[in-house]
């Protein structure tokens, strides 16, 4: 699987999940988020050669087409597959609020 366990441990040029840390205050200007200060959002990147974690039969065909026709622009894209939520703490006035935000952390990628 093209997940963090594999991708973060290997120098992989093809489609894989890459680490990306986002600081809420410094990177986004969201000063109101109390905790966490930031988090690993991660992202997917890298080429999608034939049969690399193909998501659908379409992406399999597209990957094969691109392999046999390297000059063609059509090829599968490396996109998130599994995402996990992130829990944040912020304050409304002095009242603490906890929110679980869905699909915030990319854990694995796929070619689609």
């Amino acid at each position: 699987a093209l997940d963090t366990n594999y991708c973060f441990r290997n120098l992989e040029e093809n489609c894989c999940v890459r680490p990306l840390y986002i600081d809420f205050r410094q990177d986004l200007g969201w000063k109101w988020v109390h905790e966490p200060k930031g988090y690993y959002a991660n992202f997917c990147s890298g080429p999608c050669p034939y049969l690399r974690s193909a998501d659908t039969t379409h992406s399999t065909v597209l990957g094969l087409y691109n392999t046999l026709n390297p000059e063609a622009s059509a090829s599968p894209c490396c996109v998130p597959q599994d995402l996990e939520p992130l829990t944040i703490l912020y304050y409304v006035g002095r009242t603490p609020k906890v929110e679980q935000l869905s699909n915030m952390v990319v854990k694995s990628c796929k070619c689609s």
Partner: antibody, heavy 121, light 111 residues
Amino acid sequence: EVQLVQSGAEVKKPGASVKVSCKTSGYIFMKYWMNWVRQAPGAGLDWMGQIFPAWGMTNYNEMFEGRVTLTADTSTSTAYMELSSLRAGDIAVYYCARGYGNYALDAMDYWGQGTLVTVSS
Amino acid sequence: DIVMTQTPPSLSVSPRETASISCRASESVDSYGNSFMHWYLQKPGQSPQLLIYLASNLESGVSDRFSGSGSGTDFTLRISRVEANDTGVYYCQQNNEDPLTFGQGTKLELK
């Protein structure tokens, strides 16, 4: 230039719902909280609630008894306020107003032009 | 809810004089070293505009004739050398407690 442009005046019957839009430009919509404030004729200002467009998170003033729903469309940088079960006491000008940016609850540095909602049978 | 009480309800001032508006909160609006109190002016037929942020910070583009002071529960907005353009209703607002609340307004007129 930061602009908040609201939809036009509405006339509704008692018990109906109204949905007011607030189209923004000149800043990054997903970076700031959007507040809604209402002002009854000749009266002061009442905070209704707020939304954080990037995540759809909302905080409401209990005064509005769950009748208000705030939403946002990040693709068009537009915020919406829907008020249901309208009554005569809801006749007011409704404003959208951008939060200053340091806190969730905050001052409001840019305001829409206001939308007059009239409730009449 | 924190109740904000403004005095006076209305004020008539001669041009070039100084106007003072008071705002008293039903409980302290101070936290973390800040006073969470702000001031707005609503000119006739217009939307409110922010004048003072966090009790004493002048908002960008606002005349330095406006100044704010105070902490805890008692706050003051001063307008020096009052001009015709200053007429309207002034509101204080707190955001230290949910829900955010406004004062009832002070109407400033010129003599």
